[in-house]
């Protein structure tokens, strides 16, 4: 099982969670495996049980503390190991020295709400969740709007190159149902990636006023 292609990828949410995915071709589905975290300058260790997410991949979340507590800094290195039970002992399958602030993936933005809606425009706001104060304003956002008859993949991406937790959508069609999503990414970190997309926010533009040329 060890000789198949193996990948062990983890991301830090910038506060108190490291999420890991381990994939291993030819690994036994019913094998009991876990991720163990051993920081280089902290007194705590943490373990999570890997649970199957597909035929050959497993995932788990290392919960390091209260959701908004700052458990790691830019100087921390956490040795992460995948351990799988083989008979009476645990065997190390994968290992890495994890630099949390080089491998960031924030939580999806939350609390999306329509601030103001008109016939052709809609102002939407949101909040970021469990994001470190270390970033200050060094965040960027991507947003997309789902129009009738289209898919999310077809929706053009709107980029906000600063920490701006609102957007004014223009050139919308009156009396039309839309959905909106946003995601966030810190500017810091060589392997940092976008957060998951937020839950979609559904809204409807106002109908055009009768007798008015819109």
């Amino acid at each position: 099982a060890v000789n198949g292609t193996s990948q062990f990828t983890c991301f830090y949410n910038s506060r108190a969670n490291i999420s890991c995915v381990w994939s291993q071709d030819g690994a036994l589905q019913d094998t009991s495996c876990q991720v163990h975290a051993w920081p280089d300058r902290r007194r705590w260790n943490q373990t999570c049980e890997l649970l199957p997410v597909s035929q050959a991949s497993w995932a788990c979340n290392l919960i390091l503390g209260a959701p908004d507590s700052q458990k790691l800094t830019t100087v921390d290195i956490v040795t992460l190991r995948v351990l799988c039970r083989e008979g009476v002992r645990w065997r190390v399958m994968a290992i890495q020295d994890f630099k949390p602030f080089e491998n960031l993936r924030l939580m999806a933005p939350i609390s999306l709400q329509v601030v103001h809606v008109e016939t052709h425009r809609c102002n939407i706001s949101w909040e970021i969740s469990q994001a470190s104060h270390y970033f200050e304003r060094h965040l960027e956002f991507e947003a997309r709007t789902l129009s009738p008859g289209h898919t999310w993949e077809e929706a053009p991406l709107l980029t906000l190159k600063q920490k701006q937790e609102w957007i004014c959508l223009e050139t919308l069609t009156p009396d039309t149902q839309y959905e909106f999503q946003v995601r966030v990414k810190p500017l810091q970190g060589e392997f940092t990636t976008w957060s998951p997309w937020s839950q979609p926010l559904a809204f409807r533009t106002k109908p055009a006023a009768l007798g008015k040329d819109t």
């Epitope: 062990f8 280089d40 290992i95």
Partner: nanobody
């Protein structure tokens, strides 16, 4: 299964040098990293040095940095530990170890390794 055989141990004066070698055989295709550990009487086995499959990454315990050098000869399935400026505290049984674990760390521990040699004694006289 991987078989490991150490050689090169012996008696050396303090300040002297010694070169340990480890020959690997068997399922060597599964080896990702190899390392050296040592165990003095009454003490726990401790990490000394490790090297990646390609030889591009190495790690050492602080107490041997600048004195010991680990190297790898993949064509001969050998790993070497060149030990210079030996001290009395370097006296121990030295074990070669191999792991199939994918990836790399600078903080190896004994349980990371699944194949072990029988060990070779290094004695440092003053």
């Amino acid at each position: 299964q991987v078989q490991l055989v150490e050689s090169g141990g012996g008696l050396v004066q303090a300040g002297g040098s010694l070169r340990l070698s480890c020959a690997a055989s068997g399922s060597i295709f599964s080896i990702n990293a190899m390392g050296w550990f040592r165990q003095a009487p009454g003490k726990e086995r401790e990490f000394v040095a490790a090297i990646s499959r390609s030889g591009g990454s190495t790690a050492y315990v602080d107490s041997v940095k600048g004195r010991f050098t680990i190297s790898r000869d993949n064509s001969k399935n050998m790993v070497h530990l060149q030990m210079n400026s030996l001290k009395s505290e370097d006296e121990a049984v030295y074990y070669c170890a191999a792991t199939a674990a994918v990836g790399w760390t600078s903080r190896w521990i004994t349980t990371d390794f699944d194949s072990w040699g029988q060990g070779t004694q290094v004695t440092v006289s003053s």
